[in-house]
């Protein structure tokens, strides 16, 4: 950018023509004060653009800084700007006029600004007081400016002599502002609703008592404004709130939620987004399942847990063999559903001490007006095992037959054992396993009921012998996955007068 | 339209307590602060108590440690409990919206006497 | 809060009430008579109700605020209360008769 004459700064005669002409790559303009003046813009013969200011019969009102900018900037090395600066001294005008926004200056922290008193002639000595007082501050002065300097929270007033008369400029008034680091927090009543339902949003900013706020969200694409509502916080010093609330939801207020805080003063702010989920309706989802068959001991505490989402909250039911079950005064079973998350829940069903009763089939139902899942399972409960009987018998054919029964769930195993040196059994020697061979001098039976009453299996094992030549010490052990027992009996030959 | 509706004045024994309820409608009650202001006979208004949306609450220096603010999101009404009554707590008690106040109720009357 | 207790002007005047010594924000409330609802006319230091006429405005300059009634008419002739409200409550002035002459 070129401008002509080139400057960078002019006095001129009041009631005189001054023509500024600036020129550029591409289509170029003047700026005063924000503004665009009349102006006449060409392109010229050699392909650059010119712009033609022309002031006429000027006046202390024109006083002040003049840019030349391109037209339309459209890149980095199209945003330059070249600055000019106009002085028309004008005995009738003391300081040049302020917008009464101007006369309030608002300071963070302790940083330098500017009380932009302006004169019209550049050779005038203007100085700065507090208003109360006389004596001049020492502040550099800028013409073009006006006074830069840190000032405290008090009204300033610019002086200067025109002629043989004094000329005060408006009162500038200097505030301090403590502005701290916006802390910003957004949350909402749910972040999940139906269509129909309504959403509230609350934006709360700590330590800033001048905030402005600014909200976004799906709406606005539309052009349908929410009008939010602004308000003090209370208890807690400098704290602000803004609420969004759109009292009917529909599907396409799904989104990002974005509120921006920003101090007036600097514009320095921060914001904070949070998405709304829309649903057409509620649902329920089952996260963690339990399996078809699940395990409890006898006698020990137990616990299952079943994890959904869900939206709105679902009532829950627990079901044994189809009848509602419900917490037990006696404190043998504990049900609860509580909130991981706001769509998440675990509902639990605990058995104090389980007894054999409990065993059966058990249902969890989650369910509201727009859906519902249902777990079924069956609730096994391992029951250690007992050897109930162990007895001998001699039929007239010479055998000898042992007979061991006993319970336990799950089922259990049976295993014999014998051993031929009573002394030694069974700590010093281990006895010999007996299988179900022929070849062996034994034979063996074994049988086994489910009682569904007392949801435990029986085992009756027979182990027959046919001929005992010794003495002889026989083992039934039984035993399932809660561990074992065992018992045992001495059997002697036939021809012995006695058994031990 | 916004209405605030006060119920709950009359005439009130010294050391008793009075309870004021405020029935809201027409806005979404739970997106504002609520609160009561009261006018002495012949006095100018006096702020009494408020309670923010988040269930924040402000009292003024002449019934804290008395006054109790509270409120109904479900049933959009403020309530306001003031133990210990004195003759200077006679007064109109006015029912308000926002902590800035932009809406009055029409107030109620409270005569603390024996 | 200070403001002054009273201010006269003939009707189509403009009228300037001002409030100081509050922080942040300002409101103003008019009442026509004792014992009647008060009325808000400017909240939030510059916001006025839909219902209320434009010919009320506020401002707020620094620490004081400021209620302009242009073109003062009849109807407005009332006690004006000015409040400055924060995160710690809200604290009214002493009230200002305005008197239409």
């Known amino acids: 950018l070129v401008i002509t004459p080139p400057g960078p700064e002019f006095v001129l005669n009041i009631s005189s023509t001054f023509v500024l002409t600036c020129s550029g790559s591409a289509p170029v303009m003047w700026e005063q004060m924000s503004q665009v003046p009349w102006q006449e813009a060409a392109m010229n013969q050699d392909g650059t653009f010119s712009s033609v200011l022309t002031l006429t019969n000027v006046t202390g009102g024109d006083t002040g800084e003049y840019f030349c900018v391109y037209n339309n900037s459209l890149g980095p090395e199209l945003s330059e700007r070249k600055r000019i600066y106009i002085f028309v001294p004008d005995p009738t005008m003391g300081f040049l006029p302020m917008d009464s926004e101007d006369l309030f200056i608002f300071v963070t922290d302790v940083t330098e600004t500017t009380i932009p008193c302006r004169v019209t002639d550049p050779q005038l000595e203007v100085t700065l007081h507090e208003k109360k007082v006389d004596i001049p501050l020492h502040v550099p002065y800028d013409h073009q400016r006006g006074f830069t300097g840190t000032f405290e929270d008090k009204t300033y007033i610019c002086k200067t002599t025109i002629g043989d008369r004094e000329v005060d400029s408006d009162t500038y008034y200097v505030y301090s502002l403590q502005v701290s680091s916006i802390n910003v927090s957004v949350n909402a009543v749910q972040t999940v609703v139906r269509q129909g339902e309504s959403i509230t949003i609350r934006c709360i900013v700590m330590g800033n008592d001048v905030v402005n706020f600014q909200w976004t969200y799906p709406r606005m694409k539309s052009g349908r404004l929410v009008e939010p509502v602004t308000d003090y916080l209370f208890g807690v010093p400098s704290r602000i709130g803004s609420i969004l609330h759109i009292p009917t939801a529909e599907l396409s207020d799904s989104g990002t939620y974005t509120c921006n805080v920003s101090v007036s003063v600097n514009d320095h702010g921060d914001e904070k987004a949070i998405n709304i989920s829309v649903i057409e309706n509620g649902y329920v989802r089952l996260l963690e399942t339990l399996g078809d068959v699940e395990i409890a001991e006898l006698h020990r505490s137990r616990t299952l847990r079943v994890v959904f989402e869900a939206y709105p909250m679902p009532s829950v039911l627990w079901l044994k063999d189809n009848r509602t079950l419900g917490d037990s005064g006696a404190g043998e079973l504990v049900l609860s559903t509580r909130n991981m998350s706001e769509t998440r829940y675990v509902s639990e069903l605990i058995l104090v001490r389980v007894k054999v009763s409990e065993a059966g089939y058990y249902t969890m139902r989650a369910f509201h007006e727009d859906d519902e899942v249902q777990l079924s399972f069956k609730l096994q409960v391992n029951v250690p095992v007992r050897v109930l009987e162990l007895s001998e018998s001699h039929p007239a054919n010479g055998e000898q037959t042992i007979r061991c029964r006993g319970r336990g769930m799950p089922q259990p195993n049976v295993t014999w054992s014998t051993c031929r040196d009573l002394k030694r059994c069974p700590r010093k020697l281990s006895p010999t396993p007996l299988g179900n061979s022929s070849k062996e001098e034994s034979q063996l039976e074994t049988n086994v009921t489910f009682w569904e009453e007392d949801q435990e299996y029986e085992v009756v094992s027979t182990l027959r012998l046919r001929h005992v030549d010794q003495p002889l010490s026989v083992r039934c052990m039984l035993q399932n996955s809660m561990g074992g027992d065992s018992q045992e009996v001495t059997v002697v030959p036939h021809s012995l007068p006695f058994k031990v | 339209a916004v209405t605030l509706d006060e119920s709950g004045g009359g005439l009130q024994t010294p050391g008793g307590t009075l309870s004021l309820v405020c029935k809201a409608s027409?806005?979404?009650?739970?997106?504002?602060?609520m609160g009561w202001v009261r006018q002495a006979p012949g006095k100018g208004l006096e702020w009494v108590a408020g309670?923010?949306?988040?269930?924040?609450?402000a009292y003024g220096p002449a019934v804290k440690g008395r006054a109790t603010i509270s409120r109904d999101n479900g049933q959009s009404t403020v309530r306001l409990q003031l133990n210990n009554l004195r003759a200077e707590d006679t007064a109109t008690y006015y029912c308000?919206?926002?902590?800035?106040?932009?809406?009055w109720g029409h107030g109620t009357e409270v005569i603390v006497s024996s | 809060l200070t403001q002054p207790s009273s201010v006269s002007a003939n009707p189509g005047e403009t009228v300037k009430i001002t409030c100081s010594g509050g922080?942040?924000?300002y409101g103003w409330y008019q009442q026509k008579s004792p014992g009647s609802a008060p009325v808000t006319v400017i909240?939030?230091?510059?916001k006025r109700p839909s219902d209320i006429p434009s010919r009320f405005s506020g401002s707020k300059s620094g620490s004081t605020g400021t209620l302009t009634i242009t073109g003062v008419q009849a109807e407005d002739e009332a006690v004006y209360y000015c409040g400055s409200s924060d995160s710690s409550g809200l604290i009214f002035g002493a009230g200002t008769t305005l008197t239409v002459l």
């Open positions: 922080t942040y924000n």
């Open positions: 027409g806005f979404t009650f739970s997106s504002y602060a």
């Open positions: 909240y939030w230091n510059d």
């Open positions: 309670i923010d949306t988040a269930g924040g609450t």
């Open positions: 308000t919206r926002s902590s800035y106040i932009d809406t």
